[in-house]
Structure formats: C-alpha cells, structure tokens
C-alpha cells in the first residue's frame, strides 16, 4: 500500500480507566495530513463515533475506558499529499491497581512512573495526563502509599504536587487521581508514580543522566523506518551537548550523503529543578549494515547505546 512503517515504543497502561494516545510524527503531521487509526492490522478503521468506547478523536485514539482485551498493536496511518506513514504503537494493559493487589499489577516502570524529589529542597511531582480537548479533567487528588496526602508541606497546583522541605520519608509510591468528563460521562484516572529522594544539589550534580536508551538491543525488521528517542535529564544551567554518534562520528556527518539516518531536533521540558531533553535518531530505512553497530547517545560525559538486531525467525509461520 506504499506506506512507510514506523515502530514506536510500548505503552503500558492500566485497565478500567481512560487512556488516549496522540498520533504525532513532527516531520509529517505539521502539514496538511489525514490521520486514521486501526487495530491489529484490521482494514476497518477505529470508529469516530464519540459514543463508542474506543474511538478516534481528531488525531487521538481514545479508550473510555481501557479494558484488558484492548492490549495489542495499533496503527495510525498519516497520509499527506505525497506521502503515507504507518505508525505502530504497542499497548499493553495491566489489570490491577497497586493499592488493590500486587497480582497482575504494573509489570515494569516507564519513566513517567518514576520521579525524583530533592532532599531539603522545595520540589514537585507531576501527574501526567494526556487527553484530547474533548476530555475535561477535574481537580487532582494525590495519594502516598495508598493513603490520601494531607498536611501543610503539600500543595496541589494544577497537575503538580508541590512538596516543601523534602525529607527522606517522602520517598515511596504515589498516585494522582483525576475525574475525567467526556460527553457527560465521568471516569476516574489513577496514575502510579514511584518516588525516590536524592541528596545531590541541582539535578544529579553536573553529570547528565540518560534515562533512555539503556545500552540494549532493539529488534527491528529490515527496510522499516525506526525512531529512537534519547531522553536526558540535566541541570537547568548545564552547557552539555546532546547528540547521536556512530563509529565516533556524528550521525548527520556519517550519513551526510545518503541522509538515511538523521538526528532530530532537540526538544526539552522544563521542570522546577531540571530539564528533560529529548533528541531522536531516525532510520528512514533500516539496512543490513546497521545491525550490530552501537548507535551512541552522548550527553556531556554520559553515553548510552542501542544496537539494532534482526527479529528472531518466527518458526510458527512455516
């Protein structure tokens, strides 16, 4: 069908609560494009009827709520005047909330589930709530170790929990809860966050921390398009450069002629004590020569790599 395949990272989500994912791919979606969502390579698009439990809302796919059986690979097809891209998103649903049981709960922690508070300082936690404009979010309640947070050291400000004079006892498991209203119906959103405490000044001193990648391999089919983010936390006043290299050379220089592999434009989100930087690497078409090479993300003195590897053959197909 002439569409280029792009594989995004897995999303791990909680059952019985709303979830939304926005189909954005900056080089493409910035222009005049149409976006259509599909599930598990189905030829039938996801419904656009707002009464449907799963429906497309502009560029978003919206689950009201997510259910256990919704796990799977979803595709959004972005069609421009001269291009077509199919973005694959793997959604994994876990069933139980931590406060109810440890069984069938969150199987591992993505970075949104991990946050840091700085000892002795005034700091904050963020409740990540990503939904389309059609969803109205009510005030947020915060919980620590499954008990509602009360006390003068804690202040709720929009999507943040402000914590004054952070102490070692503030580490633990937090949750933020919001009521989401859509088409007159109300749903509860509950996000878990594991919080650790650091004594270091600023954000981990002057050494930037690469959150992703983590020196690992990524299975990817030959010929596909792949985008990998490098996520870095660093102090607000840092002067570190962030870039992708291969064979000790900047990828943009290494692939200067073909431009087949390019470094993306760096973006950052500013937090009270630190910045979270993202710079991606895009493989327009994965070739055999890419396998086994360490593609390095550099951030100041910190480095982390990914290595592309061919998926293991699926013998069930034969």
């Amino acid at each position: 069908d002439g569409c280029k395949d792009i594989f995004m990272k897995n999303e791990i989500l909680s059952a019985s609560q709303p979830f939304a994912f926005n189909c954005t791919f900056p080089p493409i979606t910035s222009g005049e494009v149409s976006v259509t969502w599909y599930k598990n390579s189905s030829k039938i698009p996801v419904s656009k009827i707002i009464q449907s439990r799963i429906h497309q809302d502009e560029t978003w796919i919206l689950f009201l709520p997510m259910e256990w059986g919704d796990s799977g690979v979803y595709q959004c097809v972005i069609k421009g005047r001269d291009s077509c891209h199919r973005i694959h998103v793997n959604l994994t649903v876990f069933e139980k909330h931590w406060c109810d049981t440890s069984i069938g709960g969150l199987p591992n922690l993505s970075d949104e589930y991990k946050q840091i508070l700085h000892l002795g300082k005034d700091d904050s936690l963020t409740c990540h709530l990503h939904f389309p404009k059609s969803c109205v979010l009510g005030p947020i309640k915060w919980y620590k170790d499954c008990n509602e947070i009360k006390g003068e050291r804690f202040t709720v400000l929009e999507t943040r929990l402000l914590v004054s004079n952070v102490s070692a006892e503030d580490r633990g498991n937090y949750a933020c809860q919001a009521i989401l209203t859509h088409s007159g119906k109300q749903y509860e959103v509950l996000n878990g966050i594991t919080v650790s405490i650091t004594e270091r000044a600023g954000y981990g001193g002057s050494v930037p921390k690469i959150i992703y990648p983590k020196n690992h391999s990524i299975e990817v089919q030959l010929g596909t398009t792949l985008i990998v983010d490098c996520n870095v936390t660093d102090t607000k006043d840092n002067t570190n450069l962030r870039c992708w290299r291969v064979n000790n050379t900047l990828v943009d220089d290494y692939y200067d002629e073909s431009k087949r592999i390019r470094e993306g434009v760096e973006t950052h989100v500013s937090f009270r004590e630190h910045n979270l930087y993202t710079v991606n690497i895009t493989f327009l078409e994965v070739k055999m020569e890419d396998y086994g090479l360490p593609f390095m993300c550099h951030a100041g003195v910190s480095t982390a790599y990914i290595i592309l590897q061919l998926p293991a053959p699926d013998f069930r197909a034969y």
Epitope: C99, T101, I103, N147
Partner: antibody
Framework: QVQLQQSGTELLKPGASVKLSCKAS????????MHWVKQRPGQGLEWIGE????????NYNENFKGKAMLTVDKSSSTAYMQLSSLASEDSAVYYC????????????WGQGTLVTVSA | QIVLTQSPAIMSASLGERVTMTCTAS???????LHWYQKKPGSSPKLWVY???NLASGVPVRFSGSGSGTSYSLTISSMEAEDAATYYC?????????FGSGTKLEMK
C-alpha cells in the same frame, strides 16, 4: 539490601493457634506487599495471601480463608500471620516474602518458620 | 486458578552438560509475570529469573529463560555442581498466585 527476619520454630498441639512474625529491615521502601508462602515437607510452594502494610488491605488464597489471618504493625515494620485450628496438614515451613511496586516477583524472602503440629 | 506444570520432576546432568526444564501454564500468562526461583534444602527460595528472561542479581550468565503464553523454559548452558537444586516457576498474573511443583536438578 532488605532483610526479612522471621520468628522461631513452633511445636504445637492440634487445635491450637499460632502467630508467626516477619520483621522487615534494611533498605525497604515504604510501600510493598508482604506475602506468605507455605511449603510442606517434600512438597512444593503454596501461596497463602498478601497484605499491604500501609493500609492493612489483605487478599487471600481461597484455600486459606479461615485458616490464616494477616495483620501488620506499621510502627515496627512487622507483619504477622495467625494460623488457627491447627492440624497435622498445617505442619510446614512458612515464608514471608516481599513484592515491590513495578516488580511483580518475590525478590526477598525470610529464612522461614518451621511449624510442627503433633499430638 | 492457573496451574503450572513443570517437567521433568527430577533430572540429572553431568558437569558441562546443557540442561533445559519447562514450565507449562494451564492458561496464558504474560511474560512479565512469569518467574523462576532456585531452592536448596534448608534455605529459602532465591529469585533466579524474573519476567521470563531477566537474570536476578548474582545469577551466573550460563542461566537463561525464555517463553511466552503457556510455555516457558529455564536453560543452563553448561551444568556446574552448584546448580544442583530444585527450581520452581511462579506466576504473578492471576490470583491466586501459583508455583510449579518444581524440577529437582541433580548432579550426575
């Protein structure tokens, strides 16, 4: 490193009750589920139930409802399991073990408490 | 409840031999929730492999785990004397939590 220190060996008569303890120390985070597991001599492992110390919430294996009761003393980071109406089939080693948020496996185990029920 | 069947129940291997034991679930278990423990007589179980294929801290790299759905396995690439123990698989996906009946690995 986390340590789970369990109470000592118990020798009991049929029909008696016993309260086993498990004290968590070391680098424990404040939120974890404490689980209890039974192993009879020469047999496999059997899950009894779990308790969340921060709230006292419990979940049990149906096979142990009415037999085991899980409680906790938050101030001393100690979990307890009371076994009632003891019979010979309750003779076993009982382990406490911890599950942390985002890690649905038993990373740390107590040394076990041997319970022997004999007339 | 999910029943985990381990096979073989008992096996023996020579020094340097490759060893594979299996764990079959009565219904599908997500790979994130399938784990293995090593147990030696008089000691508590030790986490050995978590989430199907991740080695716990201190576990020798000769061990590996794999599988999905209802079929999982634990492999030792080259048997060592210290590997003699009973190995249990465990699912933390559905209540009640269950364990396999164990595979006892002996040194030949």
């Amino acid at each position: 490193q986390v340590q789970l220190q369990q109470s000592g060996t118990e020798l009991l008569k049929p029909g008696a009750s016993v309260k086993l303890s498990c004290k968590a120390s070391g680098n424990t985070v404040t939120s974890y589920w404490m689980h209890w597991v039974k192993q009879r001599p020469g047999q496999g492992l059997e899950w009894i139930g779990e308790i969340l110390p921060s709230t006292g919430r419990t979940n049990y294996n149906e096979n142990f409802k009415g037999k085991a009761m899980l409680t906790v003393d938050k101030s001393s980071s100690t979990a307890y399991m009371q076994l009632s109406s003891l019979a010979s089939e309750d003779s076993a080693v009982y382990y406490c073990t911890i599950v942390y948020f985002g890690n649905p496996w038993f990373a740390y185990w107590g040394q076990g408490t041997l319970v022997t029920v004999s007339a | 409840q999910i029943v985990l069947t381990q096979s073989p129940a008992i096996m023996s291997a020579s020094l340097g031999e490759r060893v594979t034991m299996t764990c079959t679930a009565s219904s599908s278990v997500s790979s994130s929730y399938l784990h293995w423990y090593q147990k030696k007589p008089g000691s508590s179980p030790k986490l050995w492999v978590y989430s199907t294929s991740n080695l716990a801290s201190g576990v020798p790299v000769r061990f590996s785990g794999s599988g999905s759905g209802t079929s999982y396995s634990l492999t030792i690439s080259s048997m060592e004397a210290e590997d003699a123990a009973t190995y249990y698989c465990h699912q933390h996906h559905r209540s009640p939590v269950t364990f396999g009946s164990g595979t006892k690995l002996e040194m030949k």
